[in-house]
């Protein structure tokens, strides 16, 4: 049986200051049970970008629509991107624990560049 | 059309075993955990146990006592009971789950159910 | 772990007649709820699911509404077949997945 694979097409995505940056990321099965989170960095000191279950992300939508059944896209996109937005992305998949989610699997990163606003 | 077809219930005394199964076709079953949710007679629905992959989650109620497994080579699920007490009597139900997105787990299909009574 | 309530425990309706009836939950589950009917002898079948979305197959007379601790499921002219119980279940936050302890909807 394949174990689930996080997938990241892109290694890395320019965008002009101020547009919208769209992150792609997809897993190749439902299972194992747990929830997908964005990071901005790896290790320790990595920040939540978005989290489906808690907290508040204003600039971050998702491609797919939040209702869609037994859904595999968990592209992101990130609205009125700023030069401070730059940095890799990853999308990693968390194996549902009791009481805390375990880190299961990361995709490999996509780099975001933000490009100077066109005058 | 998906089916769910569970087995191996009857009756059995406190302290002793069964083992339930499930025949699932009709959807890739190796692609969606599956769950067994239980309800004794006249009362509620009360969720038992859930397999993804290789995760597996239990209620406290059976935690220690209860095993659940899957053949993907067999598109079968399974309960193992153990230690079986009074308060397990109850048709127990096989179901598959579905997920919303982002979201957690819920129940599209379920078996007819198979009765399990636990009584001297 | 969180607790659904459902109530009233039971409803009686004439045919043709408004069914409402409700599900708290004791925290917030955002619109993670879903909801069953059991007729008697048979197994629960899924309604309706992210509080608001109808199961493919499912007569347009059931709707969900309600986010956060208080849903509503609403049958509207309710047809002989609805006679049953049904249940209501929260997946947002588990294990355990729970479920409410169900509404019986008889014949007046």
């Known amino acids: 049986e394949d174990e689930l694979q996080v997938i990241q097409p892109e290694k890395s995505v320019s965008v002009a200051a101020g547009e919208s940056a769209t992150l792609r990321c997809a897993m190749t099965s439902l299972i194992p049970v747990g929830p997908i989170m964005w990071f901005r960095g790896a290790g320790a000191g990595r920040e939540l970008i978005y989290n489906q279950k808690e907290g508040h992300f204003p600039r971050v939508t998702t491609v797919s629509e939040l209702t869609k059944r037994n859904n595999l896209d968990f592209s992101i996109s990130i609205s009125n991107i700023t030069p401070a937005d730059a940095g890799t992305y990853y999308c990693v998949k968390f194996r549902k624990g009791s009481p805390d989610d375990v880190e299961f699997k990361s995709g490999a990163g996509t780099e975001l560049s933000v490009r100077a606003k066109p005058s | 059309d998906v089916q769910l077809v569970e087995s191996g219930g009857g009756v059995v005394q406190p302290g002793g075993s069964l083992r339930l199964s499930c025949a699932a076709s009709g959807f890739s079953f190796s692609n969606f955990a599956m769950t067994w949710v239980r309800q004794a007679p006249g009362e509620g629905l009360e969720w038992v146990s859930t397999i993804g992959s290789g995760d597996t989650y239990y209620a406290d109620s059976v935690k220690g006592r209860f095993t659940i497994s899957r053949d993907n080579s067999k598109n079968t699920l399974y309960l193992q009971m153990n230690s079986l007490r009074a308060e397990d009597t109850a048709v127990y139900y096989c179901a598959k789950d579905s997920t919303v997105s982002w979201s957690g787990d819920f129940f599209d299909y379920w078996g007819l159910g198979t009765l399990v009574t636990v009584s001297s | 772990e969180i607790v659904l309530t459902q109530s009233p425990a039971t409803l009686s309706v004439s045919p043709g007649e408004r069914a409402t009836f409700s599900c708290r939950a004791s925290?917030?589950?955002?619109?993670?709820l879903a909801w069953y009917q059991q007729r008697p002898g048979q197994a629960p079948r899924l309604l309706i699911y992210a509080a608001r979305i109808r199961e493919t197959g499912i007569p347009e007379r059931f709707s969900g509404s309600g986010s956060g601790t208080e849903f509503t499921l609403t049958i509207t002219s309710l047809q002989s077949e609805d006679f049953a119980v049904y249940y209501c279940q929260q997946y947002y936050d588990w294990p355990p997945f729970t479920f409410g302890g169900g509404t019986k909807v008889e014949i007046k």
């Open positions: 925290q917030n589950v955002k619109n993670d």
